[in-house]
């Protein structure tokens, strides 16, 4: 059923809820629909590489994933690590480099599977301020070629939450990341389970705001595990 996977991030389940937290450790998160894919929010070269502390894969670059630097190391100390190339061992999709995904513990090409596929991106020029309708002409482009919004405002393309104005976080929106509002009291959230396949969500939500935590809604305690609603509540 639709509700049976509200609190799961596993790709095999569907449809999961729309939207997870964007790089905020210990905060509310929920899976989003459809394809999970390796990605991130910054590009680095080996030459200037410096360990970047992280809590989630979303905080790392396109060619990185978030993990403890040493095998069996302290789970509390995680940094962005270089992605694994084809035929290398993996535990989740985000560990594999772009164009690959984790299958049976090995990074394999996503070209061999419908799992990701090439995604066609069409950017449409709109001759006015209203971008709600996609009129005009289309052209193929890269994801970063045009930003429609002032940096930091809601809807701005961003790399990480520090790029966004106060009250906003940087969260996935299809194959980009945009500034979205931090969740307020009473808004629905889902506890982030670190087990299973946690990839990057297509529709991602922010975390609960300051002074709030994601907890089971009181009147839903009697409901079955699968349909329990979590909301942002005062500590």
């Amino acid at each position: 059923t639709l509700n049976s996977v509200l609190n799961s991030n596993a790709i095999k389940n569907l449809p999961p809820p729309l939207g997870g937290a964007a790089g905020h450790p210990g905060s509310a998160v929920s899976a989003a629909p459809g394809i999970l894919y390796p990605g991130g929010n910054k590009y680095q070269t080996i030459d200037n590489y410096q360990p970047y502390p992280c809590a989630e894969d979303e905080e790392c670059g396109t060619d990185e994933y978030c993990a403890s630097p040493t095998r069996g190391g302290d789970a509390g100390v995680q940094i962005c690590l270089a992605c694994r190339k084809r035929r290398k061992r993996c535990m989740r999709h985000a560990m594999c480099c772009p164009g690959n995904y984790c299958k049976n513990g090995i990074c394999v090409s996503s070209d061999q599977n419908h799992f990701r596929g090439e995604i066609e991106e069409t950017i449409t020029e709109s001759f006015g301020n209203d971008h709600s309708t996609l009129d005009g002409y289309s052209r193929r482009t890269t994801l970063s070629s045009k930003m429609y919004h002032t940096k930091g405002q809601e809807g701005s393309v961003c790399l990480r939450s520090s790029d966004c104005a106060s009250g906003l976080c940087c969260a996935r929106h299809f194959w980009s990341k945009i500034c979205k509002p931090v969740l307020k009291e009473g808004q629905v959230c889902t506890k982030h389970r670190r087990k299973g396949s946690h990839g990057l969500e297509i529709f991602q939500r922010c975390y609960c705001g300051e002074g709030l935590s994601c907890r089971i809604q009181k009147d839903h305690h009697q409901a079955s595990n699968s349909s329990r609603l979590h909301t942002c509540q005062r500590h």
């Epitope: 509200l6 449809p15 809820p17 729309l18 939207g19 929920s30 629909p33 066609e120 991106e121 069409t122 950017i123 449409t124 020029e125 709109s126 971008h131 709600s132 996609l134 289309s138 045009k146 429609y148 919004h149 809601e154 809807g155 393309v157 929106h173 299809f174 980009s176 945009i178 979205k180 509002p181 808004q187 629905v188 959230c189 889902t190 297509i202 529709f203 939500r205």
Partner: nanobody, 117 residues
């Protein structure tokens, strides 16, 4: 609370066409975009196509590129999926989903598309 209602599914022969619609009601916040997803029997949930009002982009999975077209109007809270040259492997329940600025779990109930060979 936002309600998403899909329509337009049905039984069609291979090579035929269908047009799915998804109407959103109860929206009090802005939507960043909407998408279509599908699940075939025994298969994983699959992204089909998406439209971003915020970025002015459309997105397609490889398997439907050139055959399916997503369109819509954010002001009218509606998104469409024009499906041409349908194949038996397109048989699935098609779901509409919305990326809202206020909450996280807006899905329609789905509409069945069956393509016979």
């Amino acid at each position: 609370e936002v309600q998403l209602v899909e329509s337009g599914g049905g039984l069609v022969q291979a090579g035929g066409s269908l047009r799915l619609s998804c109407a959103a009601s109860g929206r009090t916040f802005s939507s960043y975009g909407m998408g279509w997803f599908r699940q075939a029997p025994g298969k994983e949930h699959e992204f089909v196509a998406g439209i971003s009002w915020t970025l002015g982009r459309t997105y397609y999975a490889d398997s439907v590129k050139g055959r399916f077209t997503i369109s819509g109007d954010n002001a009218k809270n509606t998104v469409y999926l024009q499906m041409n040259s349908l194949k038996p492997e397109d048989t699935a329940v098609y779901y509409c989903a919305s990326d809202e600025s206020d909450a996280y779990n807006y899905w329609g109930q789905g509409t069945q598309v069956t393509v016979s060979s």
